[in-house]
Interface confidence: low
């Protein structure tokens, strides 16, 4: 049976899937607030452009009867249940916002023919790459692998004079949704990261990780992990660490490093933190009042999803083009739109580009300092601190393999 799209005659709707399983354990009220704030901005922008149209959101709630674990790993069917709800109601907006879980998104793509665009705050996994009508507004795993490979190969910076080709990856299976898929992409034999490295080993047990820190026979000095400093401390504690160990802590969606008066704990001295620069204006936003530093990015992605919808609506209406066409469904990519916190760029496959930031702990000030930034759009590393006050010898990052002997 055909589902009619509420997407014509001056009335345009975005369907927002409100799933119990989401990439971040964020109360649905906060997501609703973000969507509503976005709608207000969109209405204003359309009005300013002389487009007298109605824009609304319809929230589709999962009843939680079948899938109520609140865990993305069990979310495969929930997205399909919600799609069936849409099908039964025979009503759909111009755009579908959600789901955020990789399994849900992947399954929805397998089991449905999506003739409308889908915007996701999440869907981090490689299995959601290259989907023609999917737009992802939080950095997917593919972008992380590009950064890591780029950084591993870099050998022409004052603080990094060795190319790296090896790594350990710590992955114990208890990670958050974003970390789970980021680490999966590093672990997978099919991934860019795996294929550019000559050695990579996944450490799955706490003891394996702890042993490597002082193992003279270790195959790499570099360990990639994902989580926040507290997660690292629970694992590493105050254990001694060999002087040429480098831990890369992936913590993309955490603004805490940039907050005033933050001091880096001692156990972070051997650690480089990969994160993203925060959006200052979001901190004062009405809907962010209840958001922790790690949740702002998720809420912002929902808000930006609404703004993207508004941007595409404006573009198509100004050009006199039909909204319910395959052209519209495939248009949410290769563009820049005005997001809540400044311009947002989407790549050729509809994935958000961002500036990743690599931080180190200054041994002088015990503060987090920016070592370099990385622009995912142009795959380029830009050094920021040419004379970092590192813990490592000669204030340079060590070789990834100790005592290689004559090269």
């Amino acid at each position: 049976s055909q589902v009619s799209q509420n997407c014509h005659n001056g009335s345009y709707e975005i369907s927002v899937l409100m799933m119990d399983n989401s990439a971040f354990a964020e109360p649905l009220e906060n997501v609703e607030d973000a969507v509503n704030e976005g709608l207000e901005i969109v209405r204003g922008r359309l009005q300013n452009a002389g487009l007298n149209v109605t824009v609304n959101a319809s929230f589709m709630y999962s009843d939680g009867l079948i899938h109520n674990s609140g865990d993305c790993r069990s979310s495969t069917c929930e997205g399909l249940d919600l799609l069936r709800k849409i099908s039964n109601a025979k009503r759909m907006g111009c755009v579908l916002m959600g789901p955020s879980c990789t399994y849900s998104t992947f399954q929805m793509y397998l089991d449905t023919e999506l003739s409308y665009p889908m915007i996701s705050a999440g869907s981090f996994g490689l299995s959601c790459d290259y989907k023609e009508t999917l737009t992802r507004l939080m950095s997917p795993a593919r972008k992380l692998t590009y950064f890591l490979v780029n950084f591993w190969k870099t050998n022409d910076l004052p603080f990094k004079t060795y190319s790296w080709s090896t790594s350990y990856v710590y992955k114990n299976g208890t990670e958050s949704e974003d970390c789970f898929w980021y680490l999966n992409a590093l672990e997978a034999s099919v991934s860019y990261f795996s294929h550019e490295l000559s050695f990579k080993l996944v450490l799955r047990q706490d003891k394996e990780f702890q042993d490597i820190l002082m193992d003279h026979n270790r195959k790499s000095n570099v360990i990639v992990m994902c989580g926040d400093p507290e997660f690292l401390y629970k694992l590493k504690g105050d254990r001694a660490v060999a002087e040429d160990i480098v831990i890369i802590l992936v913590d993309l969606f955490n603004d805490q490093y940039f907050e005033d008066n933050v001091t880096a704990p001692d156990y972070m001295k051997n650690v480089l933190v990969l994160t993203q620069s925060p959006g200052n204006s979001l901190l004062n936003s009405s809907f962010s009042r209840n958001l922790s530093p790690t949740k702002r990015d998720f809420a912002l992605a929902y808000l930006n999803g609404i703004l993207l919808f508004g941007h595409m609506l404006k573009t198509f209406l100004e050009n006199g083009e039909n909204i319910t066409t395959p052209k519209f469904a495939h248009a949410f990519r290769n563009l820049t739109f005005e997001g809540y916190d400044g311009p947002v760029t989407l790549d050729d496959w509809g994935d958000v580009d961002s500036t990743m930031v690599l931080l180190y702990t200054s041994v002088d000030t015990k503060k987090y300092k920016v070592l370099l930034t990385y622009d995912t759009h142009v795959n380029q590393t830009n050094p920021v601190d040419m004379s970092p006050t590192f813990t490592w010898k000669n204030s340079k990052l060590p070789n990834d393999i100790t005592d290689r002997g004559p090269q």
């Epitope: 992947f106 399954q107 490689l126 790459d129 999966n184 997978a188 034999s189 099919v190």
Partner: antibody, heavy 122, light 110 residues
């Protein structure tokens, strides 16, 4: 039509060396990883190693690392397997094959050469 | 390396029979909801030919009588109705971590 054609096989004495070639045609050579797989008479398939033609990155199975080297010549659209210190147990048909990665992230050998026989015997 | 063990090692069957070959991995070959396991057919003097990829997806040009199933560590190749041209050796292969093959299952005419 995508084609892989191996050459360079033959009879070689134990301790000797041999260089096998794999000429690729019908596709963009630098876009696909190239692999070498061998099969001893009456036995199963054994992966030797792989090379990324675009940048020459190689991964060779531990078992062969000290004796076998994989290389490419992009100008000739060819991959090579240099085999040194050959032993009787290296007697096998050697195949080159490429991997394709689908957009869903699946990775497998989709095209194979016809194979070339290497016999190590005195 | 991930070890793959096929059973049986050899099998006699007749045209029209339904045949099942199994492949067991020493550890899971699953990755984001799919299994990185392939099945190949090889005839004497010929190179292997891809039949099934990702455990259950039929390769281009392969007859629908071939099907694959399984996940994690246990996989099955089924030929629903044997044809004369199906008598060959079948190999499973994983691409989850590097590349390894099963030892092969030789399918012979009864």
């Amino acid at each position: 039509e995508v084609q892989l054609v191996e050459s360079g096989g033959g009879l070689v004495q134990p301790g000797g060396s041999l260089r096998l070639s794999c000429a690729a045609s019908g596709y963009t050579f630098t876009s696909y990883w190239m692999h070498w797989v061998r099969q001893a008479p009456g036995k199963g398939l054994e992966w030797i190693g792989e090379i990324k033609p675009s940048n020459g990155l190689t991964n060779v199975h531990e078992k062969f690392k000290n004796r076998f080297t994989i290389s490419v010549d992009k100008a000739k659209n060819s991959a090579y397997l240099q085999m040194n210190s050959l032993r009787a147990e290296d007697t096998a048909v050697y195949y080159c094959t490429r991997t394709i990665t689908t957009t869903e992230g699946y990775w497998f050998f989709d095209v194979w050469g016809q194979g070339t026989l290497v016999t190590v015997s005195s | 390396d991930i070890q793959l063990t096929q059973s049986p090692s050899s099998l006699s069957a007749s045209v029209g029979d339904r045949v099942t070959i199994t492949c067991r991995a020493s550890e899971s070959v699953d990755y984001y909801g799919s299994s990185l396991l392939q099945w190949y057919q090889q005839k004497p003097g010929k190179a292997p030919k891809l039949l099934i990829y990702a455990a259950s997806k039929l390769a281009s040009g392969v007859p629908s009588r071939f099907s694959g199933s399984g996940s994690g560590t246990d996989f099955t190749l089924t030929i629903s109705s044997l044809q004369p041209e199906d008598f060959a050796t079948y190999y499973c292969q994983q691409t989850r971590k590097a590349y390894t093959f099963g030892q092969g299952t030789k399918l012979e005419i009864k």
